[in-house]
């Protein structure tokens, strides 16, 4: 049994780090493998993560962690029974992938404006809370050629779009993702998308 692609880990900078790797052949990850991790810190214990399958040869493990601080460094050992397959380390603060924003809602009852709101995925005491910026993707299932990305570089998790910039009488979808500039993170996953019907019509005199 051998590792084809070494574990690569990302932290949500809150309580979970996710490690993914590929094996040399089909593997029952949860039955055959264990990922042991330990914070390099006085009197810390070794903790065990049971991986799940992620495709035929892929494995994924969700490591429970404490709140992340920049000094934290973990040793990682991947075992198949008594055989050590791989040994490495992981500094969560240097490999951050934010949580996806949630509760994306579209408000169409505001005159001439489509208002999108969503929730910051972090509590106010988390360092990422005030560092997130967002990208909102809007597209139309009725008009495959239409897809736009709106960058939200201010802190408030809202986006206003003039309804007149969207075609009337068709449905749109939106989704949002986040990243934290000062922590040099990757983008989060996209939030679940939400759908709305654009019924806005320009006033008669503007037609």
């Amino acid at each position: 049994m051998k590792v084809l692609q070494e574990p690569a880990c990302v932290s949500d900078y809150m309580s979970i780090s996710t490690c993914e790797w590929k094996m040399g052949g089909p593997t029952n990850c949860s039955a055959e493998l264990r990922l042991l991790y330990q914070l390099v810190f006085q009197s810390s214990e070794t903790h065990t993560c049971v991986p799940e399958n992620n495709g035929g040869v892929g494995c994924v493990c969700h490591l429970l962690m404490d709140d992340v601080v920049s000094m934290d460094n973990y040793t990682l050992d991947l075992w198949a029974g008594q055989q050590l397959l791989w040994k490495g380390s992981f500094k969560p603060s240097e490999h951050v992938k934010p949580r996806a924003p949630g509760n994306l809602t579209v408000h169409t009852n505001v005159s001439d404006t489509v208002l999108l709101t969503w929730s910051n995925p972090y509590p106010p005491d988390n360092y990422l809370y005030n560092d997130l910026t967002y990208a909102v993707n809007i597209w139309s299932e009725n008009d495959p050629a239409y897809s736009r990305i709106h960058n939200v570089t201010y802190l408030k998790p809202t986006l206003r779009i003039p309804a007149s910039t969207l075609k009337s009488g068709i449905s749109y979808r939106a989704r949002v993702r986040a990243w934290a500039q000062h922590y040099n993170t990757t983008w989060s996953e996209w939030s679940p998308s939400t759908k709305w019907y654009n019924s806005y019509r320009e006033p008669f005199e503007q037609r």
Epitope: Q42, S43, S44, E45, H47, S70, M71
Partner: antibody, heavy 125, light 112 residues
Framework: EVQLVESGGGLEQPGGSLRLSCAGS????????MTWVRQAPGKGLEWVSS????????YYADSVKGRFTISRDNSKNTLYLQMNSLRAEDTAVYYC??????????????????WGQGTTVTVSS | DIVMTQSPLSLPVTPGEPASISCTAS???????????VDWYLQKSGQSPQLLIY???KRASGVPDRFSGSGSGTDFTLKISRVEAEDVGFYYC?????????FGQGTKLEIK
């Protein structure tokens, strides 16, 4: 009441051995790292050794490494210090102390917040 | 190893007056914001040491509020706002960032 009670001290000749015990009560013993600290007559405090809650991580002062062995029996709520190849400079009062919570991912530290009454070790010919 | 240097080593104080003890570490004891791994202990004559302050500034349970700890990184201070007769003894700072734990030399507080 949270309590630590040491025993096993005494007079021993250089090169001899002693085993100190520290019985814990009033707290979930296995959840906490434990530490031994000693104090030579008229001197300050000196850290000797520490052990994590599971016993999986052990630390020693250079002055005792290779001679002393720290261990614990969580089923008996007891910490031990096996002292071999004793030297005159090991003469001291030995204290056990309750250390950090080690079951959390990052051990939670609240200081060495409970100490035993101490047990005296005298190494002399 | 981290060296902990205390001063003064002797501190005569009049009851009711404030007292201050300094402790300097040879390297930073700051692990993360608010978490300086330095403690203060008092050892009274013939007794075991007792914890006063942990993580630089957190008062241990049952410790009178006249005791306070401050500082960050390498420089730490224990203050007693109004010394009482029962406060006499040896005061030790200790770093607990990692092994080996190291203590300061001790400060003997005595009543004038």
């Amino acid at each position: 009441e949270v309590q630590l009670v040491e025993s096993g001290g005494g007079l021993e000749q250089p090169g001899g051995s002693l085993r100190l015990s520290c019985a814990g009560s009033g707290f979930t013993f296995r959840d906490f790292a434990m530490t031994w600290v000693r104090q030579a007559p008229g001197k300050g405090l000196e850290w000797v050794s520490s052990i994590s809650g599971s016993g999986g991580n052990i630390y020693y002062a250079d002055s005792v490494k290779g001679r002393f062995t720290i261990s614990r029996d969580n089923s008996k709520n007891t910490l031990y210090l096996q002292m071999n190849s004793l030297r005159a400079e090991d003469t001291a009062v030995y204290y056990c102390a309750k250390d950090r919570v080690s079951i959390t991912i990052r051990p939670r530290y609240y200081g060495l917040d409970v100490w035993g009454q101490g047990t005296t070790v005298t190494v002399s010919s | 190893d981290i060296v902990m240097t205390q001063s003064p080593l002797s501190l005569p104080v009049t009851p009711g007056e404030p007292a201050s003890i300094s402790c300097t570490a040879s390297q930073s004891l700051l692990y993360s914001i608010g978490y300086n791994y330095v403690d203060w202990y008092l050892q009274k004559s013939g007794q075991s040491p007792q914890l006063l302050i942990y993580l630089g500034s957190k008062r241990a349970s049952g410790v009178p509020d006249r005791f306070s700890g401050s500082g960050s990184g390498t420089d730490f201070t224990l203050k007693i706002s109004r010394v009482e007769a029962e406060d006499v003894g040896f005061y030790y700072c200790m770093q607990a960032l990692g092994s080996p734990y190291t203590f300061g030399q001790g400060t003997k507080l005595e009543i004038k």
